[in-house]
């Protein structure tokens, strides 16, 4: 939900620096306004990583770039253009975590990011070009989804680029971005004024084109992140699609419950609760995320409450809702 500032096409009075300067000085405030409006818009990033040690094992990491508190996270997978999708895990901050094969371990990494380990063989095995989607809900603000996949040619141990591109927290990025552009704008305006202080101020004349003249868009840097949200799906092998609902859950329903102790089911309220989670400096955070852990050569640390997986003592259908097979 980004806002584009649109600037009417202005016809300069005469060719030359004066006309160009007048146009640029008019465009600049609109660009700044656009940045202010779009700063802090929540976004979601997704990172898919195939483990070098286990070729059938994937780690999906997702994060929410926004200021609201997360009320639910849903991780799903499927084929291209939404074909054959199904839910892998649902993470609720108070009610716990629910996951379905081939998801092995879903967990909160931080207050605004989760990770999911997937492994399996046969029908429910993930493939290198499967599409994974994460949807973060923040009540009552809304919800946001992003998808990612490993390209078929990816080497084990490497990650797909996080989607969308921006990795800094949205609010921080907004503040830094607007501050930087404002500073640059002021310096630029001072430079122009100083350069042209002895020249008459340019007069803007009405456009000589028709009233329906095309409008010039003031493109803000933040719109690149909007474009990044619309990443085309990777081509996927139909033989490599996630299992159908019946084959993925042969027992007729989710038979595993990822249980969190009541006190651990709540996400931490502050950094202290996640003291064991290494928090990199801002610079390294960006480089680690954008470098997709290539620099570190390590898997991202998994911390937080331990998940206890246990089959329901009443049998595989005991926890099933009326839906039956998912």
């Amino acid at each position: 939900m980004r806002t584009e500032a649109q600037v009417p096409a202005l016809q300069p009075p005469e060719p030359g620096l004066e006309g160009a300067m007048g146009h640029r000085t008019l465009v600049l405030p609109w660009v700044l306004l656009t940045l202010c409006v779009t700063a802090g818009t929540p976004e979601v990033w997704v990172q898919v990583r195939m483990e070098a040690t286990e070729l059938s094992s994937f780690t999906i990491r997702c994060g929410f770039l926004g200021s609201g508190s997360i009320s639910l996270v849903t991780v799903s997978w499927g084929g291209p253009n939404g074909a054959g999708g199904t839910t892998l895990a649902v993470l609720h901050p108070e009610r716990g975590i629910r996951q379905w094969a081939p998801a092995r371990q879903a967990r909160w990494e931080t207050q605004s990011s989760i990770s999911l380990i997937l492994e399996g063989s046969g029908a429910s095995s993930p493939c290198a070009n499967t599409t994974f989607c994460c949807k973060f809900a923040s009540f009552p603000e809304g919800s946001w989804e992003a998808c990612g996949s490993l390209p078929p040619s990816s080497d084990p141990g490497l990650s797909a680029p996080p989607t969308p591109a921006p990795i800094l927290r949205a609010d921080l990025a907004g503040i830094l971005g607007v501050s930087g552009v404002l500073l640059f704008g002021c310096v630029y305006l001072l430079h122009l004024l100083r350069r042209h202080k002895h020249r008459p101020a340019p007069r803007l004349q009405p456009s000589r084109t028709s009233p329906q003249a095309p409008r010039a868009r003031a493109w803000a840097p933040s719109q690149a992140s909007q474009a990044a949200l619309h990443v085309p799906y990777a081509t996927i092998n139909t033989s490599c699609r996630p299992a159908t609902l019946d084959t993925a859950h042969p027992h007729g329903g989710p038979s595993w419950w990822a249980s969190l102790p009541t006190h651990a089911a709540h996400r931490p309220q502050g950094p202290a609760a996640w003291a064991s989670t290494p928090i990199p400096a801002r610079g390294s955070f960006v480089s680690v995320e954008n470098g997709l852990y290539a620099q570190a050569g390590e898997r991202p640390p998994h911390t937080g409450p331990g998940l206890t997986l246990f089959p329901d003592p009443r049998g595989p259908r005991a926890m099933e809702g009326p839906l039956g097979v998912r």
């Epitope: 009320s71 639910l72 849903t74 799903s76 997978w77 499927g78 939404g82 074909a83 054959g84 999708g85 199904t86 839910t87 649902v90 609720h92 009610r95 716990g96 629910r98 599409t131 989607c133 949807k135 809900a137 009540f139 009552p140 809304g142 919800s143 946001w144 989804e145 998808c147 609902l245 099933e320 809702g321 009326p322 839906l323 039956g324 097979v325 998912r326």
Partner: nanobody, 127 residues
Framework: EVQLVESGGGLVQPGGSLRLSCAAS????????MSWVRQAPGKGLEWVST????????SYVDSVKGRFTISRDNSKNTLYLQMNSLRAEDTAVYYC????????????????????WGQGTMVTVSS
């Protein structure tokens, strides 16, 4: 941003029919289970029906079984609820939501327990 927009509500006489629609955008609709929930005046949120991601499985609360039919068209990113033989007790605001409330239990349902939610559409059954 994800958006779910319900339509089709209105005033209908007992025994009448309505078809609710929910247009989804901003997410991969076909990857997710979808549900209808409702909230009668002065009451809590009640689960009505759920359909899985490919439309092959459906479930209903007992009070609407045989009268309501949930369906979806993944090519149009739209969820439907066909309501027949409407009764006065079906009067409520109907919400389209993403997710299956059975994941965490039907007790004390709230919109915040779902992955996405619409603004709701009012259905009034009255003579």
């Amino acid at each position: 941003e994800v958006q779910l927009v319900e339509s089709g509500g209105g005033l209908v006489q007992p025994g009448g029919s309505l078809r609710l629609s929910c247009a989804a955008s901003g997410f991969t609709f076909s990857y997710y289970d979808m549900s209808w929930v409702r909230q009668a005046p002065g009451k809590g949120l009640e689960w009505v029906s759920t359909i899985n991601s490919d439309g092959g499985r459906t479930s209903y609360v007992d009070s609407v079984k045989g009268r309501f039919t949930i369906s979806r068209d993944n090519s149009k990113n739209t969820l439907y609820l066909q309501m027949n033989s409407l009764r006065a007790e079906d009067t409520a605001v109907y919400y389209c939501v993403e997710g299956d409330p059975h994941n965490f239990g039907l007790e004390n349902l709230a919109l915040r327990d779902f992955g996405s939610w619409g603004q709701g559409t009012m259905v009034t059954v009255s003579s």
